[in-house]
């Protein structure tokens, strides 16, 4: 018989124990109970009666198909209830009536068609997070469903088979910070959108085929929508439906952020927003994020000239993992307010980057991320970016660079440079002297002897250094992370000569636990405040007798130290 393991704090773990019923022996001491991934099927009225102080009850994927009406009557202190992915084909309001303290409720992945015959949640006045719906059977949203709920932090509704949406069903919730809607078709989208305009701050639309979406004027009063963020995840769009979606932005004038994640655009970027709306529609949008956009015809993609004016005020753009190999010069020149650009995981090479970072392109750009592209020459990359007069931060990590030359020309204001995971074997004077932060972690460096007068932070973990770099190279260094190298020791001279060092992370090196090193550590209790990963990451590699022991605990023999 499987048993429940509980600790002194009343946390009981019964996950994946093949329980076929709620285990006995639960007491008022039980604060947290996890019975997920079992075969419980039934919860009777007395099964949880002793758990009067229970705060968290997790019953995810427990095979439950029946819950007695008063099964939760003693759970007045319950704050978190997860009933997701069970076999509950109907829901009862009597389950939830006693749960006046409930803040989190997850009912997703159960085979109900509706949310019951009466308002399930009207007693849950403290509810902050609610997740409902399923992939296939849940098909109707009615006005009674969310009655009584006035304010939620998160509401997630999975309704991929929506057949009917009763107007104003979601309007009763006056304030929703984050609404996630899994909708397979766009048929009811306009109706839902009208109902949530005055309540939702962050709308996330998932798994939706928007190819046939058509805008029509909303019959709403003059609304000052609080919506600040709009996200589309795993959605299908066309050039035409994108134009139609843009029209929704007329109603959310405070919108600041738009995100497209794992979407498919069956088009070539031939967008044609109606001229009158162009300036208005993205009025306050500052951040546009596109991740893993799939464009089957990406080689035919237009230069987006039709939406240039839409993007002139945008400050932050991310286009990640979307097969970008070239940003047209004219497009770059129109991104007049752009301060941050992330083109990670794309196909950029220096020669095409030159076209993008053309004269007058990205005039306000301060941070550029080109991590994991096809860049091959640090010198060429630096030179091409000279046009970016305001560039202070550059991330070119995870590119496979040829050996670094001795000299390179960089934008004059460069303060941050990330060259991690680039396969570099030596650091040369090509690195700009203006840097305040340098990341060269996860490379093949066996030494570092470059003078960087303004450097405040050096990240050099996962390399092959045998000693700490000379302190005189970095007169103002505050942070050094040098984990997972081949450092065998450090001394008073080495550490004492970093006058401003506040943080040193040097764990997981191959320390030789000599008398000198161990006595130095004993003499310097203040080291603990500098070594952030002390003491667990600082282990003796040798001598064999001390192998694996923490430096803090290692004690050399008297003989060894007085030879």
């Amino acid at each position: 018989q499987a048993s429940l393991s509980c600790d002194a704090a009343g946390v009981c773990d019964g996950s994946s124990r093949s329980f076929t019923s709620i285990p006995s022996g639960l007491t008022a001491n039980t604060k947290k109970l996890d019975l997920s991934f079992n075969k419980i099927t039934y919860i009777g009225h007395g099964d949880l009666r002793a758990c009067v102080n229970l705060r968290v009850l997790t019953l995810e994927s427990s095979g439950i198909n029946t819950i007695e009406g008063d099964a939760f009557y003693s759970l007045g202190s319950l704050e978190h209830l997860d009933l997701s992915n069970n076999h509950l084909s109907s829901l009862s309001s009597s389950w939830f009536r006693p749960l006046s303290s409930l803040k989190y409720l997850n009912l997703m992945g159960n085979p109900y068609r509706t949310l019951g015959e009466t308002s399930l949640f009207s007693n849950l006045t403290n509810l902050q997070t609610l997740r409902v719906g399923n992939v296939d059977t849940f098909s109707e949203i009615r006005r009674i469903d969310f009655a009584g709920l006035t304010s939620l932090n998160e509401l997630e509704i999975q309704v991929l088979s929506l057949g009917n949406y009763e107007s104003r069903s979601l309007q009763s919730i006056r304030d929703i910070y984050h609404l996630t809607l899994h909708l397979s078709e766009s048929a009811f989208l306009l109706g839902i959108f009208a109902d949530i305009l005055s309540s939702v701050r962050y709308l996330e639309l998932r798994d939706t085929n928007l190819a046939r979406f058509q805008f029509s004027e909303l019959s709403v009063d003059e609304i000052n929508s609080p919506m600040k963020k709009l996200a589309f995840r795993n959605a299908d769009l066309t050039d035409k439906s994108f134009n139609e979606l843009l029209k929704l932005l007329r109603y959310i004038l405070e919108l600041m952020e738009v995100e497209f994640d794992h979407c498919t655009l069956n088009g070539v970027g031939n967008f044609n927003p109606s001229e009158s709306d162009v300036v208005r529609e993205l009025g306050k949008v500052e951040t546009v994020t596109i991740r893993s956009l799939h464009i089957p015809q990406f080689y035919l993609f237009y230069d987006l000239s039709t939406v240039y004016s839409l993007l002139e005020k945008v400050k932050r753009i991310t286009v990640e993992n979307s097969k970008v190999f070239l940003v047209p010069c004219s497009f770059s020149q129109h991104l007049k307010s752009l301060e941050f650009l992330d083109l990670s995981e794309n196909l950029m090479v220096e020669e095409y980057l030159k076209n993008s970072a053309c004269e007058g392109g990205w005039p306000s750009l301060q941070s550029l991320v080109l991590s994991q592209n096809h860049l091959r020459s640090i010198r060429k990359t630096a030179e091409i970016l000279l046009t970016l007069k305001n560039l202070t931060a550059l991330d070119i990590s995870k590119n496979s660079f040829q050996p670094m030359p001795d000299s390179c020309q960089w934008p004059g204001k460069m303060r941050f440079l990330n060259l991690s995971s680039t396969g570099i074997q030596a650091v040369k004077t090509c690195i700009p002297q203006t840097l305040e932060v340098l990341d060269v972690s996860n490379n093949n460096l066996d030494s570092f002897s470059l003078f960087l007068p303004r450097l405040q932070e050096l990240y050099i973990s996962r390399n092959k250094l045998k000693t700490l770099p000379e302190a005189s190279l970095f007169p103002v260094l505050q942070v050094m992370k040098i984990r997972e190298n081949a450092i065998s020791t450090f001394s008073k001279d080495q550490l004492g000569s970093f006058p401003k060092l506040e943080t040193l992370e040097a764990g997981d090196n191959h320390f030789i636990c000599s008398c000198e090193l161990l006595s130095f550590i004993l003499e310097r209790p203040a080291l603990v405040h500098v070594l952030v990963d002390w003491p667990d990451s600082y282990l003796c590699d040798s001598p064999p007798r001390l192998h694996g022991q923490r430096l803090q605990d290692a004690r050399p023999s008297v003989l060894e130290c007085h030879q």
Partner: antibody, heavy 118, light 111 residues
Framework: QVQLVQSGSELKKPGASVKLSCKAS????????INWVRQAPGQGLEWIGW????????NFNENFKDRATITVDTSASTAYMELSSLRSEDTAVYFC???????????WGQGTTVTVSS | DIVLTQSPATLSLSPGERATLSCRAS??????????MQWYQQKPGQPPKLLIF???NVESGVPDRFSGSGSGTDFTLKISRVEAEDVGMYFC?????????FGGGTKVEIK
């Protein structure tokens, strides 16, 4: 250093299928596209299609769309190209090549000779 | 499909002479300021080797006697002083539109 090593020569009968492999090393396999190109004896080069290992997306020359399948095993850094319903005019050297910058083929495998004959 | 026509079919030169190979596309291969045209060299029994990409960018490790030029539909590969090791077939290739296509090739031989 970057290398693409292809499987050995194949002799096939008309109507059969052939599956060629291309093992990559010296670079992050999922960061680049892998293309397949063939060259019939004494002829020019003909592009078959590509795959992006990161997301598995493929694109084919219409001439091969119904007969060619390109797949990858990212754990083994290997790309595969299967050609079905072989005919004598499929006799050629088949090359895999790394796609850089989305537009050019900067490293090529040594080629696999496929002979289709009854 | 974009058809690439290379000329001449064969180019026979003495060492040190200048070679000019031409590639004409049936439609423009421009993509917003960049010509998506490549040149490859292939020696007998070997795979092709990239020489030039984006019409004029010389691939790393390629001798500087090779240069590429052109835009729109007309492209040229020049070898400033031909050497014995330059013999082989030269192919142009466009990546502006799918399917990607190659020219029929120009054979360079030394007299």
């Amino acid at each position: 250093q970057v290398q693409l090593v292809q499987s050995g020569s194949e002799l096939k009968k008309p109507g059969a299928s052939v599956k060629l492999s291309c093992k990559a090393s010296g670079f992050t396999f999922t960061t680049y596209g892998i293309n397949w190109v063939r060259q019939a004896p004494g002829q020019g080069l003909e592009w078959i299609g590509w795959i992006y290992p990161r997301d598995g997306s493929t694109n084919f020359n219409e001439n091969f769309k119904d007969r060619a399948t390109i797949t990858v095993d990212t754990s083994a850094s290997t790309a595969y190209m299967e050609l079905s319903s072989l005919r004598s005019e499929d006799t050629a050297v088949y090359f895999c090549a790394r796609l850089t910058g989305g537009t050019f083929l900067d490293y090529w495998g040594q080629g696999t000779t496929v002979t289709v004959s009854s | 499909d974009i058809v690439l026509t290379q000329s001449p079919a064969t180019l026979s030169l003495s060492p040190g002479e200048r070679a000019t190979l031409s590639c004409r596309a049936s439609e423009s291969v421009e993509y917003y300021g960049t010509s998506l045209m490549q040149w490859y060299q292939q020696k007998p029994g070997q795979p092709p080797k990239l020489l030039i990409f984006g019409a004029s960018n010389v691939e790393s490790g390629v001798p500087d006697r090779f240069s590429g030029s052109g835009s729109g539909t007309d492209f040229t590969l020049k070898i400033s002083r031909v050497e014995a090791e330059d013999v082989g077939m030269y192919f142009c290739q466009q990546s502006r539109k799918l399917p990607w296509t190659f020219g029929g090739g120009t054979k360079v031989e030394i007299k």
